[in-house]
């Protein structure tokens, strides 16, 4: 049967304290984009105080919580995708 | 530096059973699914299935299912693959790797002789 | 299962020349996190495979830049901008986005 890599697609976590987590050849996160100027170009939190949130996933910051959010990659899961799935 | 390290080569009888090993360094043994891949004399590359270090959990592609048995030792950092009622078709290189979202690192490979 | 057509099956190139090798998926790779799971790997003569390119066109370290990877969805390319004679051997695309993993059927790489 064929079953994606992952179903755990989205969790939400509402810890504003994440601990910073290197984990050994975890993939890079993009570069950190320039400050903004005017309204609404404010950065995006996931570049830099929770560059290291997502343990194997990608973040996204959900606004409207004021919380990062972790995407997993294929296999892993939990709300920083720090679990394997099976 | 990550390294597989692969038990070496085995002869065995059609009919028999036999197990692999493939002892892992220089990452954190839980954190990373270890797969098992098939290659056939001048074949291509068949993936056989993965087991969680954590639990011993694992998935099977359906080709495999009653052919292979994925174990793991995580107190030796090792992960193990049975191969069972052996013939000729299952005459290979068997690779251990870890294969995951950022890259891949593979064992040297086992090579299995299937002969009477 | 997922299909991973590879072309074409073997490849006789110049030392100097360019190299072009084709991958195509039976499914879109696309993954929820918006990546594209797609590798490529090179198997040199009585060596274990070594992998090249992950998530379509991202370099693994130490790879040296001639290679790139590039495409998208269903359709992916590997390409090296001046072939070298250590880059001899079979060049695989694998799948990481479902299981199970499928790899390509190979693509030979010869050195004319």
């Known amino acids: 049967d064929l079953q994606e890599a992952d179903l755990d697609l989205l969790r939400v976590t509402l810890s504003s304290k994440p601990q910073a987590l290197a984990t050994p050849n975890k993939e890079e996160h993009g570069k950190r984009k320039k400050k903004g100027k005017g309204l609404g170009k404010k950065r995006d939190p996931c570049l830099r105080k929770y560059k290291d949130f997502c343990i194997h996933g990608e973040c996204k910051y959900v606004k409207e919580l004021r919380a990062p959010s972790c995407i997993c990659h294929p296999g892993y899961h939990g709300e920083r995708c720090h679990g394997l799935s099976l | 530096e990550v390294q597989l390290q692969q038990s070496g080569p085995e002869l065995m009888k059609p009919g028999a059973s036999v197990k692999m090993s493939c002892k892992a360094s220089g990452y954190i043994f839980t954190d990373y699914y270890m797969n098992w891949v098939k290659q056939s004399h001048g074949k291509s590359l068949e993936w056989i299935g993965r087991v969680n270090p954590n639990n011993g959990g694992t998935s099977y592609s359906q080709k495999f299912k009653d052919k292979a048995t994925l174990t793991v030792d995580k107190s030796l950092n090792t992960a193990y693959m049975q191969v069972n009622s052996l013939t000729s078709e299952d005459s290979a290189v068997y690779y251990c790797?870890?294969?995951?979202?950022?890259?891949?690192?593979w064992g040297q490979g086992t090579t299995l002789t299937v002969s009477s | 299962e997922i299909v991973m057509t590879q072309t074409p099956l073997s490849l006789s190139v110049t030392i100097g020349q360019p190299a072009s090798i084709s991958c195509k998926s039976s499914?879109?790779?696309?993954?929820?996190?918006?990546?594209?799971?797609l590798n490529w790997l090179q198997q040199r003569p009585g060596q274990a495979p070594k992998h090249l390119m992950y998530q379509v066109s991202k370099l693994v370290p130490g790879i040296p830049d001639r290679f790139s990877g590039s495409g998208s969805e269903t359709d992916f390319t590997l390409k090296i901008s001046r072939v070298e004679a250590e880059d001899l051997g079979v060049y695989y695309c694998l799948q990481g986005t479902y299981y199970p993993h499928t790899f390509g059927s190979g693509t030979k790489l010869e050195i004319k």
């Open positions: 790797a870890r294969i995951y979202y950022g890259g891949s690192d």
């Open positions: 499914q879109s790779l696309l993954y929820t996190t918006g990546k594209t799971y």
